[in-house]
Structures are given as structure tokens and as C-alpha cells.
Amino acid sequence: ESLGTEQRVVGRAAEVPGPEPGQQEQLVFGSGDAVELSCPPPGGGPMGPTVWVKDGTGLVPSERVLVGPQRLQVLNASHEDSGAYSCRQRLTQRVLCHFSVRVTDAPSSGDDEDGEDEAEDTGVDTGAPYWTRPERMDKKLLAVPAANTVRFRCPAAGNPTPSISWLKNGREFRGEHRIGGIKLRHQQWSLVMESVVPSDRGNYTCVVENKFGSIRQTYTLDVLERSPHRPILQAGLPANQTAVLGSDVEFHCKVYSDAQPHIQWLKHVEVNGSKVGPDGTPYVTVLKTAGANTTDKELEVLSLHNVTFEDAGEYTCLAGNSIGFSHHSAWLVVLPAEEELVEADEAGSVYAG
């Protein structure tokens, strides 16, 4: 199983295919969106190991930054994620794909910076309310992934300055109507809901009125539930190892998972000369699993000290979450100490610690 076959789209972000090498793709994402950059191998051939770089610095994978050989995902993007991204061949540092990414304010209704659209003296003596930025109110249907922040705005003016109130599905909408509460920013004519959930779906209406009249606008919100997936394991890890008797070995496993992953290291063993159990599945013993004072980071590394010939064999990194499992295996070959020099000369693949 490789990352290529395991990787699933997180949320509902559109995947952006990579530009031709040398071209720079200009991309704009909304705050809170999932930024997805894809860089398929040129001509569809093998690409070899790659690295993703932002503003000249290699990207470090994290819960929010998911790095694969041909795809980069940055979840819950913010202004700080704006910049120049490139996918490069690890060995040659040749740029395979180049993107210019800009993350703008809230994805919902094309906001400007806070502070704009505040109530202003328009110079009109008296008058009914009117929209000051109707072009910003075109997007009446909003579909956003769960956990994102949504902001609806109805920038208006009038004299006297109108008031604004909000309805959900035709009824008065107040903070206590949702678990996360709401933020009403009257000066910015906005309603903000953080970390939306499916129960936030519905029609939201702003009502702007003064003594000379009333205007209203209705937005429809759809909350897209994440389609959860089993963990993703970085391709090529753990890697096969050859070690000299008595040396130390480390196997590495990189796990990406939306849901809390559970990581185990297993060793394939024989029982009474058989490698498989009565039901035909391979016998394994658990070498490392979540336990007292073991962090997820520590679980991504299996350390074997002072290896013996009994340590040779197949090792499996197994990662599971509530949806399913993924696993990658690697082999350890243990060589006798006296072969160390010969093997090192011939292959350069012997690790003596």
C-alpha cells in the first residue's frame, strides 16, 4: 500500500493540478479552506523522492500539513500559509511544480479586512437602508466543510444608521441557539459562526431597517461533513534495513490521520515452524503500542538495540483509527560482524549503529 493509493481528499477542497515546470500557478484560497496542491510526475513517469518547499524552506509534516510525494495538503489555511510553494526532486532540487498561494479572509462571502464596511455618514439627509456593497452579496449559497468558520455580511447604510438583526430559517437567531455561540459584529454588518457543524445548515437572513424602511438578504448554508478515512502511511517507510550483528537499528513510520490514530509495531514470527495461524493469517507479536508515557511521535520510530540474528525478519508498522487500518512492512537482514567490511565496500548499505 502506498501513499498514492491511500491518500484521500480531506474535506471537500478542490485538488489543484500542478502547472508545467517553469510555470507559476497563481492560486487563491479562503481562510479555513484546505489548500491542496498536486504535482504529478512529468510525463507520468517515476518521480523519485520529492520535497515540498515554502518560501525556500522545506515543509515539515504535521497534523495540519500533510506531505505526500505528489500532493501537499494544508488544512484550515490562514494568512500565514500564503507564499511560494514548490515541489522539488529531493536529490537534484529541480523544481517540478511551482505555485503562488494567497489565503484571503473568510471563504464565505468574499470579506474584506475587518474594519471596512463600517457604518459611515453617507451625506444623505434621510433615507431608507440600502446595500453599500451589493457585489459582495452575490454568493447566496455557501457550502463549507465542517469545522470551518463562516461569516455572512450585509454591509448597508441609511440615515438614520439602520439596525441589523439575523434570522435562521425565518426565526430570530441568537447565540444560545448553537453550541459554539455566534458573533454579531454590528459595525461590520456581520454574523460569524466558528467551527460549523451539520446542524448549522439552513437559511440565514439579515434584516436591515430604520424608520424609513427595511431590506433583507437570505443566504443558504450547507455544511459538508468530512468523509473520514483510514490513516495514510508515507510511502517508502519503514524501509528495509541491513545491519551488522550487535548494532542498533531504527525503523521509521510516518502516519497521517484525520481521526486519532493508533500505531503499533508488529514482528512477524513463527509458531511451531508455521508463519500463519490456524485461520491462515500471519502470526505477529506486538513490539510497541500505545502505553504509559509513549507519545505518538515516539510510536513512529521502532528502535532495536544490539541486534541479534533472532531480530532478523519482517516488521510491520500498523496504524488504525475508528474507520480502518493501513500498514507497511519492511525487512531486517542481520549480517555477521566479520562481513562488515566486505559488505560495506560492496554495497555501502550496512548500518553499524
Partner: antibody
């Protein structure tokens, strides 16, 4: 949503058999071992055994050997536990419970804590 | 079989108090293979702690587990009304899987 839904309550006569079902949803049924645990009224929890839904392999607690049969139907993501030769002391709530064991391996040691449980099925054995 | 003995059998406390529940094994258990469950009347058990000290998904931070070898502890730092229930420890170090007899935490 990951869940296990069990069949309804049963009343059986001593000597009879009972078959309890456990339907899984929201995850890949064949990937996780399924265990069965029972709880007599006012008592603690007692492990009965497991089934590997992928291979059909089973492992029963010594106490239930010969009386219990665990099976599965992968086409409908359902596990079954049948207990025969019922006696009054088998009156209990029977739970199916999913574990973090990957069904493509045969584990020689522990790690089977139960992260998802069915709601339980009350089996009453009475003459 | 590994026998798990929980103490006390019943713990009478008030909301806001600290609860300390003990689980003692008849032989050594790897901390990776000890778990704690919460059960309320008429409900299935719910996984709280696995690997002796790792909180299961969605379990509040007031629950913590510790211990190694033969002595393990579940601590509830400040009892909430919904925490009054019966708690079971479980070992999966050796077959068969065994549970403690339970500690009932009741409102004083």
C-alpha cells in the same frame, strides 16, 4: 458514525440455544476483530472470545469451549454469537465489542481493549 | 488467569471531589495492555483509558490513568455529575482477557 447494533432481548428455556447478532456500520467490518463479553445481573464483565471477521477464525475462553460458536456474515457486516445448552446462570446481557486488532494478522499477545460496544442483548434463561 | 482486584468496591464522593480508583493484578501486566472502562446503569461500557495512561477519543482531561507492573490507578481530578458510574479495569496481557469486579462511584 461507527456503531454496533445488536438484536433484541431473548427468553429461553434451560437446555435451549440462543443466537445473538451484532451489525456493524460506519467502518470496514472485516478489518477489526470482534469480541463478545457478557454481564450477569449486578455482576462484572466476563470475556467469552473473539472472531476474526476477515478469516472467520475464532478463539473462545476455556469456560465456554464446546458451548459457544461465533460466526459472521461479511455480506451484511454482521457477527453472531450462539450459546447452546443454556442454564439459568447464563442469564446476562451479552455485548459485542470491536477491538484495535487488525484482522489480517493473528495476534500472539494482547492489545485488545474494546473501543466500540454494542448496546447489549439481554438473554433470560428461565423454565 | 490474571485476577484483577479493584478497590474500593464503592466510593462515596461529592461533585468536585477527587476520585482515586485502584486496580491490582495477580501477576505483572504490561502497561500497554491495561484499560479502564466506565459503565452507567442500562448502558454498555465505554472505553476511557488504554495503555494504562492514554485517554480514548472524546474522554475529558479530568480522567487520567497511571501505574505499572501490578498496581494501576484511575484518577478523576474533579468529579462531574455525569461521572457517577461503575468503573472497570481490564487486562489483555495474557489470555483470557479479564476484568476487575468494578468500583462504583456514587454521590455522597
Amino acid at each position: 458514525q461507527v456503531q454496533l447494533v445488536q438484536s433484541g432481548a431473548e427468553v429461553k428455556k434451560p437446555g435451549a440455544s440462543v443466537k445473538v447478532s451484532c451489525k456493524a456500520s460506519g467502518y470496514t467490518f472485516t478489518s477489526y476483530y470482534m469480541h463478545w463479553v457478557r454481564q450477569a445481573p449486578g455482576q462484572g464483565l466476563e470475556w467469552m472470545g473473539w472472531i476474526n471477521p476477515n478469516s472467520g477464525g475464532t478463539n473462545y475462553a476455556q469456560k465456554f469451549q464446546g458451548r459457544v460458536t461465533m460466526t459472521r456474515d461479511t455480506s451484511i457486516s454482521t457477527a453472531y454469537m450462539e450459546l447452546s445448552s443454556l442454564r439459568s446462570e447464563d442469564t446476562a446481557v451479552y455485548y459485542c465489542a470491536r477491538t484495535w486488532q487488525y484482522s489480517y494478522f493473528y495476534y500472539l499477545d494482547g492489545g485488545y481493549y474494546f473501543d466500540i460496544w454494542g448496546q447489549g442483548t439481554l438473554v433470560t434463561v428461565s423454565s | 488467569d490474571i485476577v484483577l482486584t479493584q478497590s474500593p468496591a464503592t466510593l462515596s464522593l461529592s461533585p468536585g471531589e477527587r476520585a482515586t480508583l485502584s486496580c491490582r493484578a495477580s501477576q505483572s501486566v504490561s502497561s500497554s495492555y491495561l484499560a479502564w472502562y466506565q459503565q452507567k446503569p442500562g448502558q454498555a461500557p465505554r472505553l476511557l483509558i488504554y495503555g494504562a495512561s492514554s485517554r480514548a477519543t472524546g474522554v475529558p482531561a479530568r480522567f487520567s490513568g497511571s501505574g505499572s507492573g501490578t498496581d494501576f490507578t484511575l484518577t478523576i481530578s474533579s468529579l462531574e455529575p455525569e461521572d457517577f458510574a461503575t468503573y472497570y479495569c481490564q487486562q489483555t496481557n495474557n489470555a483470557p482477557v479479564t476484568f476487575g469486579q468494578g468500583t462504583k462511584v456514587e454521590i455522597k
